[in-house]
């Protein structure tokens, strides 16, 4: 509550997160023309990345383009990308939607379609839908431990969200355990009124707000965090503005003296930890 | 404008960026003693890194040290690093400028120069100038989509920079389209009075400021962002303070049971998105 | 000092860090059943990661699990994880502490102990103590250059911590050189009353606070930073809340047609640069 006689000071904050959980992923894998069932275990080193500060990312879905090499190949036949003759292809042209530079030739993509030949990482990435349901949908059961150290330098006051009395096997609950700082990812989504299974397909951004409203006067001292959750990406976003949350990264390797890469389009949830509040003192 | 009767509250912000574009890179490549022209295509997975939050990085130039292995070798003959006898070399000494630990021996670096032998990743990195013009100078034509979600918790108000009415094929322009949140990198530099081609060589830091001055009173509601741009690194910086923006990273691999690495010194532009402003309400 | 007649404005800040130093690491390496002394040099590309913004990380210790592959194996015999018959193992169960999914069988881990068989990255990570002393304990002598650009947009005022008059071979000292922005990591710890050698074993988080108290009135202009240091992680933290600072990451590769990984549990110091302060003007 606003105490007008107090000197208010904004919070200086540092955050440390630790995600726990393993996911079982089953998908069809094609090798040497034969498709069979692939099954793998993903642990933290596989689905999250060493990130700093107020964000962490959990991969919930992916599309792989394996064995790409720098060469010439037909571009992917997106809508409007097909051609019937070389006239449609402009040498040196880089279409922002495409992944390469046109050579000026129109070549067969498959038995029925032709597209412009490009210099690119080939074969070019297929613009296929993200798998549904999401491959790491079980990430809903992962947990994250959030450690938050705060400081009001003007009041020379420091505290943290984890107290010595806390139990390391707790799970946050709005009513039963609102001070526990171990959160089940699915619960975060439920609290925000969102469906984890749905968001996991395309990815998204979830805000974890930590609000410190601190009264630092000795006679009525109070300084504990309040957690709330809200979705930060726009679920109704137009396709042209790239809905969801994904990024591409590559693993490079050499085979027969040729540099190759596996391109991974990783979809997932980026969690932003937004710490705010004030410390007031007479 | 300052409305003194209003209760002001600082903005809580979350940012999501998406870079688009491909670059054609032509450089001299030496293999087995033979130098030939190399040509390659760089896409987002090659020139940017999965980064969180209010920053993104676009690599515009690089220097590679390929096939380094942990062994003994002469250090690079920087200014003041040459020797004529073992007396000049101190066993166990780590020169902060050097990349290894001296063995105490003075050995030939090439036909004309001798330097102290070091235990290091060898051959040690040559301290050569960044290529000029920059290898990925065409990054000037890349675009970045910036999504910004803001929140005034005290006023329980949330909005974002991208509205449903916006057109996903727009490009930001200060006069013609000041609300479009797709920015051409070259335009950002032009707006800041900087030369992209020049900065791309050594790298730099560019600030994209998003200012929200929000009047949340229902009778005169206004809450839209204003974008401005300014260079954040010091272009006149003394050599000793490391001008520009670069970092080194490595790709590790095994060959003949020996661990090797390719060291990449990546120069580029780090874009910092600085969101600030207040929400005022009666 | 508080000048009540002034219009105060919070600082907008951008930070750029550059770490320098090499570490000599000696450790026991086991290959083909034979243990021998390994010696290697770590430079910035080996012990730090390309990170953005207000944080940088220096690896001071690590534990490697080499040559892991996705298969079946006995889980690590942590406290309470041993079994004597299949009844103790539940098919499909994922113990949050474990790194895999149980098959339902109890199998020998070694000559004396049996644990539940799991589908996981195998052999599963041994839960051994971080090496003591820390492998990169010499990181105490690394230095970091911190560049900080600040802006008070309302006052249209910009400055930075590095002035043209500064000497690039200085080292920060609270008394003798309080404006130098090159910091020895060991000195930062000493200033904060912490023992680098000790913290390096398990890792930790160290805050570098940069306080700008700026009087922008022309007749009594003052705007220089003040640096202070404090530890941000809780050194007295209960085991269940994961003391110290570490994360796991993996290097993937293919051998004998099987995807393998080396898992690295990296312990280290995350340095958070916390910039705060106000600019006041009549």
């Amino acid at each position: 509550s606003d105490k007008l006689y107090q000197r208010k000071e904004p919070v200086i904050s540092s955050v440390h997160t630790k995600v726990k959980g393993i996911a079982e992923v089953t998908e069809n894998v094609t090798e040497g023309g034969v498709t069979k069932l692939g099954h793998s275990i993903f642990d933290t080193a596989d689905y999250t990345f060493p990130l700093q500060g107020n964000s962490f990312f959990v991969m919930t879905n992916y599309v792989k383009s394996e064995g790409q090499v720098q060469t010439l190949c037909p571009e992917y036949p997106r809508r409007g990308a097909q051609c019937s003759s070389d006239r449609r292809c402009k040498k040196g042209w880089m279409d922002p939607q495409s992944k390469g530079i046109q050579t000026g030739r129109c070549v067969p993509y498959d038995k029925t379609r032709k597209t412009c030949e490009v210099s690119a990482w080939c074969p070019t990435e297929e613009e296929k839908e993200a798998p549904r349901p999401a491959l790491l949908r079980s990430a809903e059961n992962f947990t994250v431990l959030i450690k938050n150290n705060i400081h009001f330098p003007g009041h020379n006051y420091t505290t943290r969200n984890i107290l010595p009395t806390m139990n390391g096997s707790c799970t946050f609950h709005k009513t039963w355990d609102p001070q526990c700082s171990i959160f089940r990812l699915g619960d975060i989504f439920q609290e925000a009124g969102e469906n984890f299974t749905e968001v996991a397909v395309q990815g998204g951004i979830m805000g974890i707000e930590i609000y410190w409203d601190c009264n630092l006067d000795s006679w009525s001292h109070h300084c504990r965090p309040r957690y709330s959750f809200r979705r930060l990406d726009d679920k109704n976003m137009d396709e042209s503005f790239v809905p969801g949350y994904n990024f591409r990264y590559a693993k490079y390797y050499k085979e027969n003296n040729v540099e190759k890469r596996t391109l991974i389009k990783a979809f997932g949830i980026r969690f932003d930890i937004l710490v705010f509040g004030t410390g007031g003192k007479f | 404008s300052d409305k003194l009767y209003q209760r002001k509250e600082p903005v809580i912000s979350s940012v999501h960026t998406k870079v688009k574009g491909i670059a054609e890179v032509t450089e001299n490549v030496t293999e087995g003693g033979v130098t030939k022209l190399g040509h390659s295509i760089f896409d987002t997975a090659d020139y940017t890194f999965p980064l969180q939050g209010n920053s993104f990085f676009v690599m515009t130039n690089y220097v590679k040290s390929e096939g380094q292995v942990q062994t003994l070798c002469p250090e690079y003959p920087r200014r003041g690093a040459q020797c004529s006898s073992d007396r000049r070399c101190k066993k166990g000494w780590m020169d902060p400028q050097s990349k290894g630990i001296q063995t105490g021996r003075c050995v030939p670096y090439d036909k004309t120069r001798k330097t102290c032998e070091v235990s290091a990743w060898c051959p040690t990195e040559e301290e050569k100038e960044a290529p000029r013009p920059a290898l990925l100078r065409s990054a000037e034509n890349f675009t970045v989509l910036i999504k910004n979600n803001i929140h005034f918790p005290g006023h329980n108000y949330t909005t974002r920079n991208i509205l449903p009415t916006m057109n996903g094929s727009c490009t930001f322009h200060k006069t013609w389209d000041p609300q479009c949140s797709i920015f051409r990198l070259g335009d950002i530099f032009q707006e800041a009075g900087e030369n992209f081609t020049e900065v791309a060589v050594q790298g730099g830091i560019m600030g994209i400021e998003i200012y929200w001055d929000c009047n949340l009173d229902s009778w005169s509601h206004h809450c839209r962002p204003r974008y401005s741009f300014r260079r954040l690194d010091d272009k006149n910086m003394d050599e000793s303070f490391v001008p520009g923006y670069n970092f080194r990273y490595a790709k590790y691999y095994k060959e003949n049971n020996v661990e090797k690495r390719t060291l990449i010194k990546a120069f580029g532009i780090r874009f910092d998105i600085l969101v600030f402003g207040t929400g005022g309400k009666f | 000092s508080d000048k009540l007649y002034q219009r105060k404005e919070p600082v907008i800040s951008s930070v750029h860090t550059k770490v320098k130093g090499i570490a000599e690491v000696t450790e026991n390496v086991t290959e083909g059943g034979v243990t021998k002394l390994g010696h290697s040099i770590f430079d910035t590309a080996d012990y730090t990661f390309p990170l953005q913004g207000n944080s940088f990380f220096v690896m001071t210790n690590y534990v490697k699990s080499e040559g892991q592959v996705q298969t079946l194996c006995p889980e690590y015999p942590r406290r309470g994880a041993q079994c004597s018959s299949d009844r103790r193992c539940k098919k499909g169960w994922m113990d949050p502490q474990s790194k895999g999914i149980q098959t339902g069988r109890c199998v020998p881990y070694d000559k004396t102990r049996k644990t539940c068989e799991v589908s996981a990255w195998c052999p599963t990570e041994e839960e051994k103590e971080a090496p003591r002393p820390a492998l990169l304990r010499s990181a105490e002598n690394f230095t970091v250059l911190i560049k900080n650009n600040i802006h008070f947009p309302g006052h249209n005022y910009t400055t930075r911590n590095i002035l043209p008059t500064m000497n690039g071979s200085c080292t920060f000292h609270k008394t003798w050189d309080p404006q130098c922005s090159i910091f020895r990591l060991g000195d930062i710890f000493q200033e904060a009353g912490e023992n680098f050698t000790e913290v390096a074993v398990q890792g930790g988080i160290m805050g570098i606070e940069i306080y700008w108290d700026c009087n922008l009135d022309s007749w009594s202009h003052h705007c220089r930073p003040r640096y202070s240091f404090r530890r941000l992680d809780d050194k007295n933290m209960d085991e269940s809340f994961v003391p110290g600072y570490n994360f796991r990451y993996a290097k993937y590769y293919k051998e004998n047609n099987v995807e393998k990984r080396t898992l690295i549990k990296a312990f280290g110091i995350r340095f958070d640069i916390l910039v705060f302060g106000t600019g006041g003007k009549f």
Epitope: - | - | G67, V69, T71, R105, E117, S119, C122, P123
Partner: nanobody, 120 residues
């Protein structure tokens, strides 16, 4: 039906060499640990060597330094290269594999055995 088929056994003089092979065939998800065991007349079956899917090997003390186990993950085959053979290596050699028919459905499979005889 999953099968393990061994080959390469035979008669050899002391100090000689042999190479055993064992291939897994049939419909399955994954071959995990593979191994060779042996059983001499009137004795219990004993482990000779095993190899994980990640190529980690383990040998009985009696064969360490003389025998080498290896595998080919494309062909789902395990090999045992036996050098400096001794008369006490004479036995029936059995191939073993821990194979997942489906996800988390592992079973232990054995080959029919192949005879190795070392004459002095």
């Amino acid at each position: 039906e999953v099968q393990l088929v061994e080959s390469g056994g035979g008669l050899v003089q002391a100090g000689g060499s042999l190479r055993l092979s064992c291939a897994a065939s049939g419909n399955f998800f994954r071959v995990n640990t593979m191994a060779w065991y042996r059983q001499a007349p009137g004795k219990q079956r004993e482990l000779v060597a095993d190899i994980t899917r990640g190529d980690r090997t383990n040998y009985a003390d009696t064969v360490n330094g003389r025998f080498t186990i290896s595998r080919d993950n494309v062909r789902n085959t395990v090999y045992l290269q036996m050098n400096s053979l001794k008369p006490e290596d004479t036995a029936a050699y059995y191939c073993y594999a821990r194979i997942e028919l489906g996800v988390l459905e592992p079973r232990d499979y054995w080959g029919q055995g192949t005879q190795v005889t070392v004459s002095s």
